[in-house]
C-alpha cells in the first residue's frame, strides 16, 4: 500500500520471492527527486529491532543495522535519484521471510510502504528422454525446491489425462539439508506428442516441455513467481 | 580509478608487531568494504578478514581472532591491519582489496600492490 | 566454516587446450563463488563471481558454472597470457575462503 497526500509522498512495494543462497531483490519505489542528499531509505524488517537497511545524504548508514543483515544488504545508490530504493539482499535465507517496510523521505515529502518477502527454492526443470529404461520414458529433473513442490505431467495429446499411475516422483535432499531435488519420471511416452512436466509450490511454478518426435527432441522451460506484483 | 596503494616492506623479529596500511582512492571510502588476504612465499591465498570503513564493523578468520587487528581512517581514507605476536611463519606479502558490492559484502574486485612482512631473527 | 578444495593442484596444458579447474564446497549451497588469476610478483586479478558472471574486461574464453558444492572454472582455448596460479574463492558466508590454488603450465 502507498501513502499519498499533502506532505506525503507514494512509495510502491512489489511482493516478491527469494530463492535461498541466491541474491534476492526488496522492490520499492517511490516519487522521484533530484535531491540527493535530501532522500533518506529506510528498510525495516517485523519483528526485528534495528534496521534492516538505512541510506541517507547519498550513501549508506549502517549504524543502526540489525547484525543479521550486516554485510548482506545494498541499495542500487545510481538508481535512488530516479526513485528507485529497491534493497539488494546477499545469500537469501529461510529466515530472511516476513514483512518488510520501505520508508522514504525527500524534499517533498515522506511515505512508506510494505511487502511480504518469502523465500524458498525453485529452479527450472530439464526434461530428457531416459533410453536406459524397458520401455520409453521421460525424466524431469529440477535441482533445488523448497518447500517441497507437487508434480503433475500432461500431455498436448491426451489433454485432462491422468499421469499419476505411469509417472514416479521422488525428492532427495540436497548436501545443505534444506532443499531438494526433484526428479519425476514418466513411462510409456508416445513419439509425436509434447509432455509437460509441471513442479509447483506456493512459491513459484515451473514448466519443462518436451516434444519427441522421430527425427529430433525440443525442450523448452520456464519459471514464474506466484503472487508477485504490488 | 579505484586505487589502493600499500605501505612498504617490513622486516620484523618474531614477538613483535606490525602494521600495514592501505590508502584508498577513486571511490567512496566508507562505503565498501576492505579485506585483507595474505600469500606465504610459494603458497595460495589466505583471507584474514575484512572492515567496513562507514562503521568499523569487522569479520575475522578465526585463526587470525586475537592477533589481527583491523581498523581505519576515515580522513584519510586508509585502512589498516595490525599483525602481534608474529612468529616465522607470519612471513608473507600481505594484499588489501576492495570489496565489490557497497555495503554489500561481495568479491574482491582490486587490489593493493602487496606489503611484503619478513619476521627473522 | 566453508572450505574449497580446489583441483587439480596444477597441470600441463598447450596453447589452445580447453581447461577445467574445479572447487567443491566442503557443505551448504550458495552461488558465491569467484574465481581469480595470480601471475608471480603480482596481486590477484577477478576473473568471474556469483558462479558465472564475467568482470568486464575479462575475455569471453574465460567462464564459470557450478551448483550445490561444484564449482568449474573453464578456459575455452588457453591462450599463451593464461598460463598462471587461479584460485576460487567462497564469498557467501561470514568467512571468506580460499581454495588452495591450480598452478597452470606450458606442456
Known amino acids: 500500500f502507498g501513502i499519498s497526500g499533502k506532505h506525503f509522498i507514494t512509495v510502491t512495494t512489489f511482493t516478491s520471492a527469494g530463492n535461498i543462497g541466491e541474491d534476492g531483490t526488496l522492490s520499492c519505489t517511490f516519487e522521484p527527486d533530484i535531491k540527493l542528499n535530501g532522500i533518506v531509505i529506510q528498510w525495516l524488517k517485523e519483528g526485528i529491532k534495528g534496521l534492516v537497511h538505512e541510506f541517507k545524504e547519498g550513501k549508506d548508514d549502517l549504524s543502526q543495522q540489525h547484525e543479521m543483515f550486516r554485510g548482506r544488504t545494498a541499495v542500487f545508490a545510481d538508481q535512488v535519484v530516479v526513485g528507485n530504493a529497491s534493497l539488494r539482499l546477499k545469500n537469501v535465507q529461510l529466515t530472511d521471510a516476513g514483512t518488510y517496510t520501505c520508508y522514504i523521505r525527500t524534499s517533498k515529502g515522506k511515505g512508506n510502504a510494505n511487502l511480504e518477502y518469502k523465500t524458498g527454492a525453485f529452479s527450472m526443470p530439464e526434461i530428457n528422454v531416459d533410453y536406459n529404461a524397458s520401455s520409453e520414458s521421460l525424466r524431469c529433473e529440477a535441482p533445488r525446491w523448497f518447500p517441497q513442490p507437487t508434480v503433475a505431467w500432461a500431455s498436448q495429446v491426451d489433454q485432462g489425462a491422468n499421469f499419476s499411475e505411469v509417472s514416479n516422483t521422488s525428492f532427495e535432499l540436497n548436501s545443505e539439508n534444506v532443499t531438494m531435488k526433484v526428479v519425476s519420471v514418466l513411462y510409456n511416452v508416445t513419439i509425436n506428442n509434447t509432455y509437460s512436466c509441471m513442479i509447483e509450490n506456493d512459491i513459484a511454478k515451473a514448466t519443462g516441455d518436451i516434444k519427441v518426435t522421430d527425427s529430433e527432441v525440443k525442450r523448452r522451460s520456464q519459471l514464474q513467481l506466484l503472487n508477485s506484483g504490488p | 580509478e579505484v586505487q589502493l596503494v600499500q605501505s612498504g616492506a617490513e622486516v620484523k623479529k618474531p614477538g613483535a608487531s606490525v602494521k600495514v596500511s592501505c590508502k584508498a582512492s577513486g571511490y567512496t571510502f566508507t562505503s565498501y568494504w576492505i579485506g585483507w588476504v595474505r600469500q606465504a612465499p610459494g603458497q595460495g591465498l589466505e583471507w584474514i578478514g575484512d572492515?567496513?570503513?562507514?562503521?568499523?564493523?569487522?569479520n575475522y578468520n578465526e585463526k587470525f581472532k586475537g592477533r589481527a587487528t583491523l581498523t581505519r581512517d576515515t580522513s584519510t581514507s586508509t585502512a589498516y591491519l595490525e599483525l602481534s605476536s608474529l612468529r616465522s611463519e607470519d612471513t608473507a606479502v600481505y594484499y588489501c582489496?576492495?570489496?565489490?558490492?557497497?555495503?554489500?559484502?561481495?568479491?574482491?574486485?582490486?587490489w593493493g600492490q602487496g606489503t611484503l612482512v619478513t619476521v627473522s631473527s | 566454516d566453508i572450505q574449497m578444495t580446489q583441483s587439480p593442484s596444477s597441470l600441463s596444458a598447450s596453447v589452445g587446450d580447453r581447461v577445467t579447474i574445479t572447487c567443491k564446497a566442503s557443505?551448504?549451497?550458495?552461488?558465491?563463488v569467484a574465481w581469480y588469476q595470480q601471475k608471480p610478483g603480482k596481486a590477484p586479478k577477478l576473473l568471474i563471481y556469483y558462479t558465472s558472471t564475467l568482470q568486464p574486461g575479462v575475455p569471453s574464453r574465460f567462464s564459470g558454472s557450478g551448483s550445490g558444492r561444484d564449482y568449474t572454472l573453464t578456459i575455452s582455448s588457453l591462450q599463451p597470457e593464461d598460463f598462471a596460479t587461479y584460485y576460487c574463492?567462497?564469498?557467501?558466508?561470514?568467512?571468506?575462503?580460499f581454495g588452495q590454488g591450480t598452478k597452470v603450465e606450458i606442456k
Open positions: 557443505q551448504g549451497f550458495n552461488k558465491y
Open positions: 582489496a576492495r570489496l565489490d558490492g557497497s555495503s554489500y559484502r561481495g568479491a574482491m574486485d582490486s
Open positions: 572492515i567496513y570503513p562507514g562503521g568499523g564493523y569487522t
Open positions: 574463492l567462497q564469498y557467501g558466508n561470514l568467512l571468506y575462503a
